[in-house]
Interface confidence: medium
Amino acid sequence: HGTELPSPPSVWFEAEFFHHILHWTPIPNQSESTCYEVALLRYGIESWNSISNCSQTLSYDLTAVTLDLYHSNGYRARVRAVDGSRHSNWTVTNTRFSVDEVTLTVGSVNLEIHNGFILGKIQLPRPKMAPANDTYESIFSHFREYEIAIRKVPGNFTFTHKKVKHENFSLLTSGEVGEFCVQVKPSVASRSNKGMWSKEECISLTRQYFTVTN
């Protein structure tokens, strides 16, 4: 009776810095009592650890049990459907979950105006789950880069893109007034990690005063 249930069609990780979420697709025609068992394997320790016996959601936060991701050879995860005494075969993640799979993000972007320049400061992510010594800048210690996109509302341009190699940037506004909206996407030049655009931060520049808005 062990393999009567169909297996979850796919299992994958979606991860940001110290936010490691395992996802899976539901089995077809699951019942109200169907749940999912999650197990984790750490490369170098070739045994599967059961993490959750019966998750009724389609995702599971594995951050707490993968805190050493950035100092390890990575992980694989597997999920199977369980319904009463019946269970499916395991579905295993297709790829190794390693630091390369982590989508890079920024914490926030702070904007201010000074002498006709928009000055931006990129705040790096500071997740609560991260061990004290595992900061973004210690793990990605070299070749951090950021793509900056700015659009002006209303304006004669939709965006200007710039790649900077540090956490500060400046844009000379050249007398333009209006609302300037900024997004940032991080990358690391020596790595293949994807980056995610930050939420837009906007700053209003008039000839008399300026205000910061979100």
Partner: nanobody, 127 residues
Framework: EVQLLESGGGLVQPGGSLRLSCANS????????VGWFRQAPGKGREFVSA????????YFGDFVEGRFTISRDNSKNTLYLQMNSLRAEDTAVYYC????????????????????WGQGTLVTVSS
């Protein structure tokens, strides 16, 4: 002296693509911000796109909407504008221009910032 010569214009159907080139036959413009403007029949000159000397900063007009990409090859002293998903309203004479200066500045959205201009190449989008 910077001397700019555009090429690559022509007739294209809506939805089609063109790649414009701008060659500099004068002294190198590798230290210049260079860009493209356009002028539609009966209208003023309009900013299209610009790129800084090392390619790390690009600027686009508000009508571009991700359809165009700008690039440059300093070893060939050439600027490019790849135009995709062309529309009838993109019909215009496209001019290449070069400005001095490196700062990330909105001045490069303005005609007055550009000291050197080409003669233009006509792009016609029509079925």
């Amino acid at each position: 002296e910077v001397q700019l010569l555009e090429s690559g214009g022509g007739l294209v159907q809506p939805g089609g693509s063109l790649r414009l080139s701008c060659a500099n036959s004068g002294r190198t413009f590798s230290s210049h911000t260079v860009g493209w403007f356009r002028q539609a029949p009966g209208k003023g000159r309009e900013f299209v796109s610009a790129i800084t000397w090392n390619g790390d900063t690009t600027y686009f007009g508000d009508f571009v909407e991700g359809r165009f990409t700008i690039s440059r090859d300093n070893s060939k002293n050439t600027l490019y504008l790849q135009m995709n998903s062309l529309r009838a309203e993109d019909t215009a004479v496209y001019y290449c221009a070069a400005a001095t200066g490196q700062v990330w500045s909105l001045q490069y959205l303005r005609e007055s910032s550009y000291a050197y201009w080409g003669q233009g190449t006509l792009v016609t989008v029509s079925s």
